[in-house]
């Protein structure tokens, strides 16, 4: 069953290659366990960036080697993606699934366009 998911249209990564955005879902059910997946769409190809399953009121737990971190508050998930470079610029889509208990709901946001600008290398300086 479908569920509405909202996320910002555009986000600019900072100079350290970190971008944060909020993914908000309109929960029609009484979900206690939620799965959040971040997908990247570039050149009509969609790849999974990271995913986490969390219990309502608890922290999101991504895999140890994940480039994502996040926190949850009610029906909002604050997602942070790290280690981004200019080549990672693209549309990052938030997918939310209400996993347990039934009924199962799934919603996909319209995506957040994340722009990443590689910092200029510092010029060598003579002392």
């Amino acid at each position: 069953k479908a569920m509405h998911v909202a996320q910002p249209a555009v986000v600019l990564a900072n100079s350290r290659g970190t971008a944060s955005f909020v993914c908000e879902y309109a929960s029609p059910g009484k979900a206690t366990e939620v799965r959040v997946t971040v997908l990247r769409q570039a050149d009509s190809q969609v790849t999974e960036v990271c995913a986490a399953t969390y219990m309502m009121g608890n922290e999101l737990t991504f895999l140890d080697d994940s480039i994502c971190t996040g926190t949850s508050s009610g029906n909002q998930v604050n997602l942070t993606i790290q280690g981004l470079r200019a080549m990672d610029t693209g549309l990052y889509i938030c997918k939310v699934e209400l996993m347990y208990p039934p009924p199962y709901y799934m919603g996909i946001g319209n995506g957040t366009q994340i722009y990443v600008i590689d910092p200029e290398p510092c010029p060598d300086s003579d002392f």
Epitope: T32, E33, T53, M55, E97, Y100, P101, P102, P103, Y104
Partner: antibody, heavy 120, light 112 residues
């Protein structure tokens, strides 16, 4: 191939214990809730217990509450059912079941079942 | 006694249409929870036949259809065939029991 394989069934005396296992393969086990469903000889299906993907949420049927314990080891892709204080009425084929399609919460995957016989 | 009520048996001749009912309450079907239908052939594990009231998994013929209204649901089988002879179960989540509930099952016999 998506598969569930139960094991651990057998003959046990009333008051005894048994531990059932269900090995999963072919899907992201940790993402999905799992359930145990049983069927007594010649009878209908009865849901026994369910556990969320993380293992953080657990529910039991009233008929087994306080006697059965469901658990899962996501690192081993395995679901368990610890059955204590077994009674004759617990005699049944025990199935593990799940939904792994990401489209609904109906049980679209079932194991072949393992028979538990409680008799003296 | 099952939480969801089904007729214990149903029958029909090849080519006929048969309907199996499933009646629940305000804590399951009436609470808005979807009804799922399972087919169990003799000596085998149950198989998902209809999910979310009226949707068919791939591979299930369109002879099988489901519907839901209020606190009840029904499964219809048209163009009955001998291989449809099986037990049919409805199921739904129950809010007050915090668990899945099944109907008692309907044994479908294909006559002739």
């Amino acid at each position: 191939e998506v598969q569930l394989l139960e094991s651990g069934g057998g003959l046990v005396q009333p008051g005894g214990s048994l531990r059932l296992s269900c090995a999963a393969s072919g899907f992201t086990f940790s993402s999905y809730a799992m359930s145990w469903v049983r069927q007594a000889p010649g009878k209908g299906l009865e849901w026994v217990s369910g556990i969320s993907g993380s293992g953080g949420y657990i529910h039991y049927a009233d008929s087994v509450k306080g006697r059965f314990t469901i658990s899962r080891d996501n690192s081993k892709n395995t679901l368990y059912l610890q059955m204590n204080s077994l009674r004759a009425e617990d005699t049944a084929v025990y199935y593990c079941a799940t939904y792994s399609s990401g489209l609904h919460d109906a049980f679209d995957i079932w194991g072949q079942g393992t028979l538990v016989t409680v008799s003296s | 006694q099952s939480v969801l009520t089904q007729p214990p048996s149903a029958s029909g001749t090849p080519g006929q249409r048969v309907t199996i009912s499933c009646t629940g309450s305000s804590s399951n079907i009436g609470a808005g929870y979807d009804v799922h239908w399972y087919q169990q052939l003799p000596g085998t594990a149950p198989k998902l036949l209809i999910y979310d009231n009226n949707k068919r998994p791939s591979g299930v013929p369109d002879r099988f259809s489901g519907s839901k209204s209020g606190t009840s649901a029904s499964l219809a089988i048209s163009g009955l065939r001998s291989e449809d002879e099986a037990d049919y179960y409805c199921a739904a989540w129950d809010d007050s029991l915090n668990g899945w509930v099944f109907g008692g099952g309907t044994k479908l016999t294909v006559l002739g």
